[in-house]
């Protein structure tokens, strides 16, 4: 682990890999191509990262600056309630969800949106620089 990191942050970290953006104490990857939710998750895991888990409203607002109308997959799913991939519940923001069949979470510049998981979307990975294991 890079110095000062814990499960949700990595402070005083070195720079991020190519094509990743350093923001705060984390590295973010904004995809150019589109995949379904599961394939997006696999892409992130293969790079020692995880589909974006947002820790608070501040992080969400900061990231939305880099987003457009296009939705991006994030590490949020509805399994008897909306939960992040780290197991924590979604409690700082509302997700626009209309249908029981929409069980994966996405984000755009306007907020969080539920979608059917096989829809091909852009995605966002998040990690600590240089394979730090504090993934979220």
């Amino acid at each position: 682990l890079c110095q000062g990191s814990n499960y949700s942050t990595c402070a005083s970290c070195p720079s991020c890999p190519d094509r990743w953006m350093k923001y705060g104490n984390h590295c973010y990857y904004f995809s150019v191509e589109e995949k379904d939710w599961n394939s997006s998750l696999e892409f992130c895991l293969a790079r020692d990262s995880h589909l974006l888990v947002i820790t608070d409203n501040q992080e969400m607002s900061l990231l939305q600056v880099f987003l457009s109308e296009a939705f991006c997959w994030i590490g949020l799913r509805n399994n008897s309630g909306w939960r992040w991939e780290d197991g924590s519940p979604l409690n700082f923001s509302r997700i626009s969800s209309n249908s029981f069949v929409q069980t994966c979470g996405a984000i755009n510049k306007n907020g969080l949106q539920a979608s059917s998981c096989e829809v091909p979307l852009h995605w966002v990975c998040k990690k600590c620089p240089f394979a730090d294991q504090a993934l979220f």
Partner: antibody, heavy 125, light 112 residues
Framework: QVTLRESGPALVKPTQTLTLTCTVS??????????VGWIRQPPGKALEWLAH???????WYELALKSRLTISKDTSKNQVVLTITNMDPVDTATYYC?????????????????WGQGTTVTVSS | DVVMTQTPLSLSVTPGQPASISCKSS???????????LEWYLQKPGQSPQLLIY???NRFSGVPDRFSGSGSGTDFTLKISRVEAEDVGVYYC?????????FGQGTKLEIK
């Protein structure tokens, strides 16, 4: 609570144009992944898909009827309108609108998770 | 077009007994994304259709667990483990994997 309600004339004459309106509530017609479709059911027969329109105004029609169908939406009024030209007695049916959920294809695969109560249209002179 | 053929076209079941409806497609309805878009709808007398099962085996919200869907490729089945009086109506299978989307001709379930 999601609801859809169809409205339109109960009787039309052959060669006339039928205009059906679906008024929705409980969701927005502009929300990503949402659409509204029209399905009809002739008396004693099976269901037949006619057309659907997506949140971004992308429209799809049943090929055999495409030249006669027009689907449109007015997001501010929460309404989807289907028009069918040159009506014929074989078009006599109950017409349903249903909400359709996007799975990644504009033309097909989706779930119709909520339906209106239907409106019966008879074509007769 | 993909033809969806349901059997039987009607069945009469004693309350508490199981029921099974078959739906066969004229070609495979496994989509290129590996999902199978096969759904089951129930149209109760005088009502509009309602979604029961989506993507072969997933129960829609509020659908009792006595309803289950199974199958793959071209052969699909809807099972009701214990039929209740409220289950009467016409059951339709629906495929959304290929354009145009198509429905089966319907199976009428009655109570003995």
């Amino acid at each position: 609570q999601v609801t859809l309600r169809e409205s339109g004339p109960a009787l039309v004459k052959p060669t006339q144009t039928l205009t059906l309106t679906c008024t929705v509530s409980g969701f927005s017609l502009s929300t990503f992944g949402m659409g509204v479709g029209w399905i009809r059911q002739p008396p004693g027969k099976a269901l037949e898909w006619l057309a659907h329109i997506w949140w971004d105004d992308d429209k799809w029609y049943e090929l055999a009827l495409k030249s006669r169908l027009t689907i449109s939406k007015d997001t501010s009024k929460n309404q989807v309108v289907l028009t069918i030209t040159n009506m014929d007695p074989v078009d006599t049916a109950t017409y349903y609108c249903a909400r359709v959920i996007y799975y990644g294809s504009r033309s097909a695969y989706y779930s119709m998770d909520y339906w209106g109560q239907g409106t019966t249209v008879t074509v007769s002179s | 077009d993909v033809v969806m053929t349901q059997t039987p076209l009607s069945l009469s079941v004693t309350p508490g007994q199981p029921a099974s409806i078959s739906c066969k497609s004229s070609q495979s309805i496994v989509h290129s994304n590996a999902h199978t878009y096969l759904e089951w709808y129930l149209q109760k007398p005088g009502q509009s259709p309602q979604l029961l099962i989506y993507k072969v085996s997933n129960r829609f919200s509020g659908v009792p667990d006595r309803f289950s869907g199974s199958g793959s490729g071209t052969d699909f089945t809807l099972k009701i483990s214990r039929v209740e009086a409220e289950d009467v109506g016409v059951y339709y299978c629906f495929q959304g994997s290929h354009v145009p989307v198509t429905f089966g001709q319907g199976t009428k379930l009655e109570i003995k």
